[in-house]
Amino acid sequence: ALDTNYCFSSTEKNCCVRQLYIDFRKDLGWKWIHEPKGYHANFCLGPCPYIWSLDTQYSKVLALYNQHNPGASAAPCCVPQALEPLPIVYYVGRKPKVEQLSNMIVRSCKCS
Amino acid sequence: ALDTNYCFSSTEKNCCVRQLYIDFRKDLGWKWIHEPKGYHANFCLGPCPYIWSLDTQYSKVLALYNQHNPGASAAPCCVPQALEPLPIVYYVGRKPKVEQLSNMIVRSCKCS
């Protein structure tokens, strides 16, 4: 699987999950989140050659098409597969509230 | 929706479904499919700017990150959303067989 265990410990050039830290204020302009100040969101990057973690029948066909037509602009793309939530603390006035923000962290990628 | 109805009738530059015809023999090297000789597989292409048909909370966050950090390599990607099957005819010896190949045709795209 193209997950953090594999991708973070390798020099994989093909589609893999990459490290990305997002600072809520600086990178998103969000002042409303109190904790954490930012988080490891990660992102997916890398080419999707034929047989590389292909998602559907269609993506397999497209990768094969790409192999036969190397100059084509039609190719599978490296996108998130498994996403995890992020617990945050924000304030409603002076009162702290805890919330789970769903689908915020990329754990693995796929070619789609 | 970034579907064939909208995308094929517009000059949309952002993520949209595009026309792509795949010839089974020429483009895939598949000789085993008797009918059809090829099909309109379509593909997804175009940038995913902030607010453009974003799939999950993560893709919205990543697009917002991208807006604040225009030079970043982390950005959502245009990939298939709705896929449809393709009925085909192939031969087992001299005996024709009809089969549905699932997830073969792109009907719409999303930014993931």
Partner: antibody, heavy 120, light 108 residues
Framework: QVQLVQSGAEVKKPGSSVKVSCKAS????????ISWVRQAPGKGLQWVGG????????NYAQRFKGRVTLTADTSTNTVYMELSNLRTEDTAVYYC?????????????WGQGTLVTVSS | ETVLTQSPGTLSLSPGERATLSCRAS???????LAWYQQKPGQAPRLLIY???SRAPGVPARFSGSGSGTDFTLTISSLEPEDFAVYYC?????????FGQGTKLEIK
């Protein structure tokens, strides 16, 4: 420049619902919380609630809980306020306003207001 | 909920005079959870002061805010003709956000 443009005036019957829209432009929509404030004719200001775009976290004044729903559509930079089970005392001008950044905060830009009249 | 009481209800002054508007909270708001707005007939409110004493962008220097705890003041050092309007204080320390009932500043 920052602009909040609201939908037009509405006349509703008691017991029905109303949905008011507020389209934002001129700034990064998802970076600020949007609050809704109402003002009955000749009266003061009353906070309805606020919504955080992207994550769709909403906070409501207790008196409106169960009757009001605030949502944000990031694809169109639009926030919606839906108020159900309308009463005659809900007749007011409803304003959307951008907060300075926190869930409860001062409001630096306001829409032009939407008059909702509830009458039988 | 936190009740804000503004005084006076109406203030009659002439251009050039100094205006002092008061806002009292039913419980302590600390030092930075109060805002002041100006509203003219048929218009939306306009933010003047936030954090009790910070002037919003574009607001003239004649407007100033002060106070902490339960007592807050908006001062207009020298009234201009365009300053005659209704003024509201707002607290955002606790949910729900509440507003004072307003002070009407009218020309004497």
């Amino acid at each position: 420049q920052v602009q909040l443009v609201q939908s037009g005036a509405e006349v509703k019957k008691p017991g029905s619902s109303v949905k008011v829209s507020c389209k934002a432009s001129g700034y990064t929509f998802s970076s600020n919380v949007i609050s809704w404030v109402r003002q009955a004719p000749g009266k003061g200001l009353q906070w309805v609630g606020g919504v955080i775009p992207i994550v769709d976290i909403a906070n409501y004044a207790q008196r409106f809980k169960g009757r009001v729903t605030l949502t944000a559509d990031t694809s169109t930079n639009t926030v919606y306020m839906e108020l159900s089970n309308l009463r005659t005392e809900d007749t007011a001008v409803y304003y959307c306003a951008r907060t300075l950044g926190l869930v409860l905060d001062a409001m630096d830009y306001w829409g032009q207001g939407t008059l909702v009249t509830v009458s039988s | 909920e936190t009740v804000l009481t503004q005084s006076p209800g109406t203030l009659s002054l002439s251009p050039g005079e100094r205006a002092t508007l008061s806002c009292r909270a039913s419980q302590s708001l600390g030092s930075s959870y109060l805002a002041w707005y100006q509203q003219k007939p048929g218009q939306a409110p306009r933010l003047l002061i936030y954090g009790a004493s910070s002037r919003a962008p574009g607001v003239p220097a004649r407007f100033s805010g002060s106070g902490s705890g339960t007592d807050f003041t908006l001062t207009i050092s020298s009234l201009e003709p365009e300053d005659f309007a209704v003024y509201y204080c707002q607290q955002y320390a606790d949910s729900p956000i509440t507003f004072g009932q307003g002070t009407k500043l009218e020309i004497k």
